[in-house]
């Protein structure tokens, strides 16, 4: 996988009036490392490693850059003509990547009310617009506004990409020490479901990198895919990942089952806790890990946030 730096910005308007401030989040190699504090108007570290490794100067620079980008995005939103009453959002996702062969990529994507209407390649300045007439209209609005802005030259886009790559390289260098292999913590839990069947769940957490094998075995043999349920491998906010796998077994047969984990050349098997005492009668088996948005505003205003 290439190394990547991604910024996610959003501005809102209510009844045609663009709200002050903006929402922002930064991801390094898919891991959250930055969040923008709207109250304090500052970029802040997200996750322990970002706090430990990236110095104060980083957050000053990020605050300046994000403030400028946020103002840009607010100005762009004011030029979107079709704003009816109610709440609207304009979101920009900016990504730069360094691939294994040292080649680079850069792009930005714009969403209006959660719908993609414009993608730009920052290296070639080529734009892509979805087929829908709404997307075409929105893209035209925005590009026309940019043409009027003397700042939005090819040099500006190239600088944007160069700046992003420079940061990415700097962050990767800072992060080398912490981006070592972190083995998962594995834990197995049981919950009684019905008629003598138990759901056993195996959770792996706090591991890095994200590639992992997690599977249930019966008598040492992997269960078929259709008898297991897997969770997504998700960032846990600390520069590491988490995931889970669950299956249903007959009560009394716990001893036959183990959770097998393989990660970065290491492996391990983890038995099911046996005995009635360890079967948690009322434990919820809600395996859905919801990605909580940047800010309570997303919950409150039901804005769709594109990852």
């Amino acid at each position: 996988e290439p190394h990547s730096l991604r910024y996610n910005l959003m501005v809102l308007s209510q009844d045609g009036s663009v709200q002050s401030g903006f929402l922002a989040e930064g991801h390094l190699d898919g891991q959250p490392f930055l969040r923008y504090d709207r109250q304090k108007r500052r970029a802040k570290p997200q996750g322990q490693w970002a706090e430990d490794v990236l110095g104060a100067k980083t957050w000053d620079t990020e605050t300046e850059d994000l403030t400028e980008n946020g103002q840009d995005l607010r100005r762009t939103l004011t030029h979107i003509k079709d704003q009816k009453g109610g709440l609207h959002s304009l979101q920009e996702i900016r990504v730069c990547e360094i691939h294994e062969d040292s080649s680079t990529r850069g792009s930005r994507h714009f969403y209006y009310d959660g719908e993609l209407f414009l993608s730009q390649n920052l290296e070639t300045q080529e734009s892509t617009v979805p087929q829908s007439s709404r997307a075409q209209t929105l893209a035209m609005n925005v590009t026309n506004f940019w043409k009027e802005d003397a700042m939005k030259t090819k040099t500006h886009y190239r600088a944007m990409q160069a700046d992003c790559l420079q940061k990415l390289q700097r962050y990767l260098k800072s992060g080398v020490a912490i981006r070592r292999t972190v083995p998962p913590m594995v834990n197995v839990t049981c919950s009684e479901v019905s008629e003598g069947n138990i759901t056993v769940t195996c959770r792996a957490s706090s591991f890095y990198p994200r590639n992992i094998t997690l599977t249930w075995r019966q008598d040492g043999v992997s269960l078929s895919h259709n008898t297991q349920q897997w969770g997504d491998v998700l960032p846990d906010g600390n520069g590491t990942y988490q995931t889970w796998v669950a299956t249903r077994i007959r009560q009394g047969e716990e001893q036959r089952f183990t959770c097998y984990m393989e990660h970065s050349g290491n492996h391990g098997t983890h038995p099911v806790p046996s005995g009635k005492a360890l079967v948690l009668q009322s434990q919820r088996t809600d395996h859905h890990h919801h990605h909580h948005g940047l800010n309570d505003i997303f919950e409150a205003q039901k804005i769709e946030w594109h990852e």
Partner: antibody, heavy 118, light 107 residues
């Protein structure tokens, strides 16, 4: 390739005990269970139990509990089966086997003949 | 314990024959059934797992089928190296149990 090399034949006296070994090679020993199977002369196969070399966890056939004890030595990738209080009923060929993680008893050792005789 | 019954203890067949060996379980075993081949020198080999999946490296003349409590192993075109004893084994419930075996001989 996966190989399970078992120890040689044993002639033991009634009441004594014996330890059969099974040395694994060609794969990561702690990844897969080791299973033990008994075959009395001219008879069928009987599953004794299995051990998880990663953590030493064992599961036994109730019939062999107290008769067989399964252990492993991770440093030498070797599994052991200790049989105690031997009687003529324990005279048999004992096999160890392992899995590829997708099917039981995928690979078998060549067998160890244990003869219990006064 | 789940009893595995191989009613035919020995079977004579000629080279090139299609041979079917049957096995029945004392109760339904949800296709959790394997077939093994034991050569006269004692060497044991897995042929079929989970009723019908052919183990890697096993010739395609071997096939397995069945459901519920009744299962079978078929050798479509008997070869000299197939002369052996064949065992079925269930892994639906502990203890894991084997059939008594079917010894295949040449006519």
């Amino acid at each position: 390739q996966v190989q399970l090399q078992q120890s040689g034949p044993e002639l033991v006296k009634p009441g004594a005990s014996v330890k059969v070994s099974c040395k694994a090679s060609g794969y990561a020993f702690t990844k897969y269970n080791i299973y033990w199977v008994k075959q009395s002369h001219g008879k069928s196969l009987e599953w004794i139990g299995y051990i998880d070399p990663y953590n030493g966890g064992t599961v036994y056939n109730q019939k062999f509990k107290g008769k067989a004890t399964l252990t492993v030595d991770k440093s030498s990738s070797t599994a052991y089966m200790h049989l105690n209080s031997l009687t003529s009923e324990d005279s048999a060929v004992y096999y160890c086997a392992t899995t590829d993680g997708y099917s039981l008893f995928t690979y078998w050792g060549q067998g160890t003949l244990v003869t219990v005789s006064a | 314990d789940i009893q595995m019954t191989q009613t035919t203890s020995s079977l004579s067949a000629s080279l090139g024959d299609r041979v079917t060996i049957t096995c029945s379980a004392g109760q339904g075993i949800n296709n959790y059934l394997n077939w093994y081949q034991q050569k006269p020198d004692g060497t044991v080999k897995l042929l079929i797992f989970y009723t019908s999946s052919l183990q890697s490296g096993v010739p395609s003349r071997f096939s397995g089928s069945g459901s519920g409590a009744d299962y079978s192993l078929t050798i479509s075109n008997l070869e000299p190296e197939d002369i052996a004893t064949y065992y079925c084994q269930q892994y639906s419930k502990l203890p894991l149990t084997f059939g008594a075996g079917t010894k295949l001989e040449l006519k």
